[in-house]
């Protein structure tokens, strides 16, 4: 079958890294600089992806494979094959169209990307706040208040009058 196919279509003999050149009697010609063909039998070579500006080269283009990009430090990849680069923020911040903004009171973000998320509500699980939340960290829930009766635990509960949180921005 392969022989039959190649008799019918001489282009099928052209390997990856070449293209079937109609201008030269369908001879297999090497891909020109800055282009590639990743499969055999191609009638054209594809232009290599350029990694510039917010993108930087992770893998150089070759005659048989496209370049691969990642993001310049300060930004991180989004999308399949790093199709976009998005700005990093500090922990305790989230990215908005106005740039990186501090998490609002009652929310936190422990990563350089993503959104600020609400602190865990310990009382929903019948627990008390063991460690207050901050912009960068969630609250830590401890045993339920009932478990903290004298002699039941060595954990000292936080002062009851204080709302969990962090210093004002």
């Amino acid at each position: 079958f392969e022989r039959t196919r190649s008799l019918q279509d001489p282009c099928s003999n052209c390997p990856a890294g070449t293209f079937c050149d109609n201008n030269r009697n369908q001879i297999c010609s090497p891909c020109p600089p800055n282009s590639f063909s990743s499969a055999g039998g191609q009638r054209t070579c594809d232009i290599c992806r350029q990694c510039k500006g917010v993108f930087r080269t992770r893998k150089e283009c070759s005659s048989t494979s496209n370049a691969e990009c990642d993001c310049t430090p300060g930004f991180h990849c989004l999308g399949a094959g790093c199709s976009m680069c998005e700005q990093d923020c500090k922990q305790g911040q989230e990215l908005t169209k106005k740039g990186c903004k501090d998490c609002c009171f009652g929310t936190f973000n422990d990563q350089k990307r993503g959104i600020c998320r609400p602190w865990t509500n310990c009382s929903l699980d019948g627990k008390s706040v063991l460690v207050n939340g901050t912009k960068e960290r969630d609250v830590v829930c401890g045993p339920s208040p009932a478990d903290l009766s004298p002699g039941a635990s060595s954990v000292t509960p936080p002062a009851p009058a204080r709302e969990p949180g962090h210093s004002p921005q």
Epitope: V54, G79, S83, M84, C85, K97
Partner: nanobody, 123 residues
Framework: EVQLVESGGGLVQPGGSLRLSCAAS?????NYWMNWVRQAPGKGLEW???????????YYVDSVKGRFTISRDNAKNSLYLQMNSLRAEDTAVYYC????????????????SGQGTTVTVSS
Amino acid sequence: EVQLVESGGGLVQPGGSLRLSCAASGFTLSNYWMNWVRQAPGKGLEWVANINQDESERYYVDSVKGRFTISRDNAKNSLYLQMNSLRAEDTAVYYCARGGEGYGVDHYGLDVSGQGTTVTVSS
């Protein structure tokens, strides 16, 4: 081919001004949010400013507020950055970058950027 080409960089004294330009080709500028980002020597990339399609929204990093102005001319397929009261810390390569499809809704990713233009602020 989708392309962005920056120009207008150069050497300027502290307190001076420069106007950077970015020529877009291969796509319709008026459909996209546009951004300026910069990379100072030995530092990471920093977002500087962005502008929405009809210029009704413009935002800036705190360090350039009141000194830099981002603008665009959709008819000329061009983006600009007017830089006044320049400081030594503004020395960087400046890149113009396009906000990807869904920018400001699903993400703040940039999908195309140019080769950059170098701004040096020194006496």
